[in-house]
């Protein structure tokens, strides 16, 4: 078996972590964000060829059934594995608060 | 904002459970799964468009993202958001074996 | 290098006023948040409030809201912490400590300022 | 009476292995994160850990980090005798955002 993060098509060509640098009004928050204005979003973007970085059994069956029925079934989708936790001072009807998000920027990727 | 179960581009072009029938031999088990012969694989296929089925934050932020950067970012993807236990029998040196795999066949799905 | 610099240790009276300060260094000042934390003596950390630099927010801890006020002046990179009428009960080690890219942990601290009240 | 409980003390010698409990709920370490600091005498705290498990640059792969329901552990392997010090588990708790166990004294015996 191909080692799973090796990626086939070239480096940096595969599922992995980027960072795409973000402004409030990119994200949409800036009616409801005062901080921080700026974020590093780091997400999981990249091709998910054969054997690489596959999450789970179900990944593993979904290649070969694309590979079978490319028209019906698409490949593996390049996914966050788990995330970084993230806080942000958010405006409220009183003033500001602090709420602490656990979904917002993935920490490693995976296909599925 | 939208219903996040509304398919804005027509019924059943959006991310949702589909059912493809696949034998041993589709999906690269026949030198290990006795049975069963055919299994009805559950997965999720189709769209992400904008707000439908967003599993977290996370899902918002690379819609806002794709539309500004389409060509850097992708949109979000359809994977499963929970998988349906499943039993095999499969060869083992000494004979046979059950075994359950707990993340063969997706249950529901959802856009990341 | 990332550097925090407090201003040095400080005797009060009760019901005096007191402001301490935290510079920071190495780093883009408006970029990262920075807190507070209190240690009485012989005892643990307790997180008092925070400040975005940049937009000078401030959050306080339940405890201590009212109680001290924070502020920032970015020209100069410093944060600030403030007492308009100390107590006995203030006397403690009073930590600045820069907030990580996620806002979530203290990646840099300050090396602490001790305020002593007492009659 | 802190939100997230450490015990008081623990001791090893050098060489040992020593694990530091953190316990919270299910408002705090449960859904969220865990930080550890160490704060050797007569000085501030420095990071040890963030996010569950993760090290910063210079500190040794002695020190690891885990979670496990509304648990959180760190574990030092190799005990040495600067390892002595103030360990303090931090997360966050809705109410009164971010919070501190109490604070665990680590003696390296001998």
């Known amino acids: 078996a191909r080692n799973g993060d090796r990626c086939p098509l070239g480096p940096g060509r595969c599922c992995r972590l980027h960072t795409v640098h973000a402004s409030l009004e990119d994200l949409g928050w800036a009616d409801w964000v005062l901080s921080p204005r700026e974020v590093q979003v780091t997400m999981c973007i990249g091709a998910c060829p054969s054997q690489f970085r596959e999450a789970n059994m179900h990944a593993q069956i979904k290649m070969n059934l694309h590979r079978l029925k490319p028209d019906t079934v698409p490949a593996p989708c390049c996914v966050p594995a788990s995330y970084n936790p993230m806080v942000l001072i958010q405006k409220t009807d009183t003033g500001v608060s602090l709420q602490t998000y656990d979904d917002l920027l993935a920490k490693d990727c995976h296909c599925v | 904002a939208r219903n996040g179960d509304r398919c804005p581009l027509g019924p059943g072009r959006c991310c949702r459970l589909h059912t493809v029938h696949a034998s041993l031999e589709d999906l690269g088990w026949a030198d290990w799964v006795l049975s069963p012969r055919e299994v009805q694989v559950t997965m999720c296929i189709g769209a992400c468009p904008s707000q439908f089925r967003e599993a977290n934050m996370h899902a918002q932020i690379k819609m806002n993202l794709h539309r500004l950067k389409p060509d850097t970012v992708p949109a979000p993807c359809c994977v499963p958001a929970s998988y349906n236990p499943m039993v095999l029998i499969q060869k083992t040196d000494t004979g046979v074996s059950l075994q359950t795999y707990d993340d063969l066949l997706a249950k529901d799905c959802h856009c990341v | 290098e990332v550097q925090l610099v407090q201003s040095g240790a400080e005797v009060k009276k009760p019901g005096e006023s007191l402001k301490i300060s935290c510079k920071g260094s190495?780093?883009?000042?408006?970029?990262?948040?920075i807190g507070w934390v209190r240690q009485m003596p012989g005892k643990g950390l307790e997180w008092m409030g925070v400040?975005?630099?940049?937009?000078?927010?401030?959050i306080y801890s339940p405890s201590f809201q009212g109680q001290v006020t924070i502020s920032a002046d970015k020209s100069i990179s410093t944060a600030y912490l403030q007492w308009s009428s100390l107590k006995a009960s203030d006397t403690a080690m009073y930590y600045c400590a820069r907030y990580g890219r996620y806002g979530t942990y203290f990646d840099y601290w300050g090396q602490g300022t001790l305020v002593t009240v007492s009659s | 009476q802190s939100v997230l409980t450490q015990p008081p003390s623990v001791s090893g010698a050098p060489g040992q292995r020593v694990t530091i409990s953190c316990s919270g709920s299910?408002?705090?370490?449960?859904?969220?994160?865990v930080n550890w600091y160490q704060q050797l005498p007569g000085t501030a705290p420095k990071l040890l850990i963030y996010s569950n498990d993760n090290r910063p640059s210079g500190v040794p792969d002695r020190f690891s980090g885990s979670k496990s329901g509304t648990s959180a552990s760190l574990a030092i392997t190799g005990l040495q005798a600067e390892d002595e010090a103030d360990y303090y588990c931090q997360s966050w708790d809705s109410s009164s955002n971010y919070v501190f166990g109490g604070g665990t004294k680590l003696t390296v015996l001998g």
């Open positions: 190495g780093y883009s000042f408006t970029s990262y948040w």
């Open positions: 299910s408002s705090n370490i449960g859904v969220l994160y």
């Open positions: 400040i975005d630099p940049g937009g000078s927010y401030t």
